[in-house]
């Protein structure tokens, strides 16, 4: 049998096989050693007994999407049946005091591979034996502690395979420079040691994506905005936009990145080299936000210039093909690629990423201030508590509720919270009365809210003993 017979039903075309050469991977036309690595079809009854105590599940993840040319990393994690784990020696043991269907096990080992390998290696002194090989016959790499690695992982994609010896978790990185754009399938088959042979224990597949567009995400934050995830923000307050570029392999680390913003509110094009930008909308309504991210990334070189005619002088080796960004009104991302040819084939290509959002701008409470605090004299002497009136002003829309949170002087330990609806006039001037139990210093957080906004002000106040002569003090605001 060949690798492709064993590993995959997806058969890439000859073109795909030729143009998607992965560095360090081998062609799936190679022969598979079925004696050492038996092949079971899906539904084969032998799967039931491939692992003591149940089935092993393999979980395959990747940090896809990957910008073409960058590295994509695949991780496989094995999930063992309940109460089983891998120990420091790579053996599979029962967890202490863990009860599964079979109850507590007397034998601490599910698989004691250390003992097996000592018993059955029959090696030739080099540490190498005929069964310490991968399915294609290549010997296991002998780095320190390799004996504790008892799982064999075979990765398969784009008509090629990669073999790896590992523990219950492995990672493989692939450079995507030669990978066709779009979704691709990665399949992994996992075997475990079984004496002098191997037994399949799990198969898993996952789709990954290679793209020529920079994967871009934007987070938006605004002070006083009640719900930051609904893309509704407040007029006349800055919104902070933070651009996150998905680049887990740091492919763009040395690239100059430009962020070209169109906020959709007649502010034209705003270009920045900073991934964060603040923008204030001064109108209510719905606006279309567009971001184009541009990065000069390592990329393919253009074809070499045609050989010169004999009568002409030889052109310089360093030829530059450049086309400049267009700023004409038009769809974002219609800029031609920029290529530069330099002698060592170390060329750059402009890559673009795009983000679009529709954001809604509404009126909101922009600011709240405590302008006065008054100790209210109570008709009945009340030795333990003080009534205090806070006179509060606000800017922006009219609040519908007020909350006060009274806490210790560090503002960390809440003592009580009171919220109540308010009816405020256009001037936005209101009085909030609150009770303080006993003298001392208190932190007061006062918030005014409506449907879309929540504005906060804080102050430290000193409540004196119930001596009419002692004044109320605002410690600081």
């Amino acid at each position: 049998k060949r690798f492709h017979d064993v590993l995959g039903n997806e058969r890439p075309s000859a073109y795909m096989r030729e143009h998607n050469q992965l560095n360090g991977w081998s062609s799936d036309e190679n022969d598979w050693n079925e004696k050492l690595y038996p092949v079971w079809k899906r539904g084969d009854m032998r799967w039931k007994n491939s692992w003591k105590g149940g089935r092993v599940q393999a979980v395959l993840t990747s940090d896809s999407p990957a910008l073409v040319g960058s590295n994509i990393t695949f991780a496989v994690n094995l999930i063992f049946p309940r109460c089983q784990k891998e120990d420091a020696n790579g053996n599979i043991v029962y967890e202490k005091n863990c009860r599964n269907e079979a109850g507590l096990s007397a034998d601490p080992y599910v698989y004691n591979w250390t003992a097996w390998s000592e018993d059955s290696d029959g090696e030739n002194g080099t540490g190498q034996s005929h069964h310490n090989v991968f399915p294609d016959g290549k010997p296991f790499p002998h780095h320190p502690g390799w004996r504790r690695w008892n799982f064999i992982y075979v990765f398969h994609t784009l008509g090629q395979y990669f073999q790896k010896l590992g523990r219950c978790s492995v990672r493989v990185s692939v450079n995507t420079a030669n990978v066709t754009l779009g979704p691709q399938l990665m399949e992994v088959t996992v075997y475990r040691r079984h004496g002098r042979a191997y037994v399949p224990i799990a198969q898993v597949k996952d789709v990954y994506v290679v793209t020529d567009q920079i994967p871009v995400f934007v987070t938006m934050f605004q002070k006083n905005d009640r719900n930051s995830s609904d893309e509704t923000f407040l007029k006349d307050l800055p919104i902070m936009f933070d651009v996150l570029i998905h680049d887990p392999s740091h492919f763009l680390n040395y690239s100059t990145i430009n962020y070209k913003w169109s906020f959709g509110d007649n502010t034209g094009l705003f270009v920045s080299t900073n991934h964060t930008v603040n923008h204030t909308y001064v109108l209510n309504g719905t606006f279309s936000l567009n971001l184009t991210v541009k990065a000069a990334a390592p990329g393919p070189c253009p074809p070499p210039p045609p050989p010169p005619r004999p009568s002409k002088p030889t052109p310089s080796l360093a030829t530059t093909l450049k086309s400049y960004d267009s700023n004409t009104p038009g769809p974002a991302g219609d800029n031609p690629l920029e290529l530069s040819r330099i002698p060592d084939e170390n060329c750059q290509i402009n890559r673009y990423g795009h983000f679009q959002a529709t954001i809604t701008i509404v009126e909101g409470i922009l600011e709240v201030n405590i302008i006065q605090m008054t100790d209210v004299l109570m008709p009945v002497p009340w030795p333990e508590s003080s009534l205090i009136d806070f006179v509060v002003t606000c800017q922006g829309s009219i609040p519908t509720e007020v909350c006060t949170i009274i806490s210790d002087p560090t503002c960390e330990i809440t003592q009580n919270t009171v919220c109540s609806p308010v009816d405020v006039d256009e001037m936005c001037l209101l009085t909030v009365r609150r009770t303080f139990n006993g003298s001392g210093t208190y932190c007061v957080n006062l918030t005014l809210g409506d449907d879309t906004s929540l504005a906060l002000t804080s102050t430290l106040i000193s409540v004196p003993d119930r001596d009419p002569a002692s004044p109320l003090r605002m410690a600081n605001s």
């Epitope: 502010t267 920045s272 309504g285 009104p329």
Partner: antibody
């Protein structure tokens, strides 16, 4: 290519109104805000206001709030500015402009 | 409203000289400043946006710099065709304002 074609020169009397137009070609009118700018002879540029033709949002320079009214007709790709209660102070060249593009200007003369 | 102030109404220069025109905003406008060129009898033309980015087709002798409240527009080697009035404009909010303009005269 993008072009903004403005209506011809206007000669009118004080107290009347005038409506000038700006026809966009080479792009979709509703994609970009249309701005209007005033320039009196020998003077600088004064921003009057702007309209988003896709939803008719408008914003004005407070100085022109009661003087100018901006409208747009997506079907004909045309933006309009109406100036009312004209005085000699309104005599000027009026430009329409979108991001990076300017019309050739409409000259308004108000004279009795 | 944001006020844009160009301190020099006129600047005199010679062909081949380097000349810089300044503009000050009454409040922080980040880098949201554009520069326009207006030649006699013509509409203005956008040269620079976002403080330092040349608009399509603008020769590279025109550059811009600055952020916050202070901005500079520079012509590295003045040509006769650069005789014009140069206006700064903020595009920080929906409501634009222009500077008063600086007229560049060729000696």
């Amino acid at each position: 290519q993008v072009q903004l074609q403005q209506s011809g020169a206007e000669l009118t009397k004080p107290g009347t109104s005038v409506k000038m137009s700006c026809k966009a070609s080479g792009y979709t009118l509703s994609s970009y805000w249309m701005n209007w700018i005033k320039q009196r002879p020998g003077q600088g540029l004064e921003w009057i206001g702007t309209i988003n033709p896709s939803n008719n949002y408008t914003a004005y320079n407070l100085k022109f709030k009661d003087k100018a009214m901006l409208t747009a007709d997506k079907s004909s790709s045309t933006a309009y500015m109406q100036l009312s209660s004209l005085t000699s102070e309104d005599s000027a060249v009026y430009y329409c402009a979108t991001w990076g593009y300017w019309g050739q200007g409409t000259t308004l003369t108000v004279s009795s | 409203d944001i006020v844009m102030t160009q301190s020099h109404k006129f600047m005199s220069t010679s062909v081949g000289d380097r000349v810089s025109i300044t503009c000050k905003a009454s409040q922080d406008v980040s880098t949201a400043v554009a520069w326009h060129q207006q030649k006699p009898g013509q509409p203005p033309k956008l040269l620079i946006y976002s403080a330092s980015y040349r608009y399509t087709g603008v020769p590279d002798r025109f550059t811009g710099s600055g952020s916050g409240t202070d901005f500079t527009f520079t012509i590295s080697s003045v040509q006769t065709e650069d005789l014009a009035i140069y206006y700064c404009q903020h595009h920080y909010t929906t409501t634009w304002t222009f500077g008063g303009g600086t007229k560049l005269e060729i000696r």
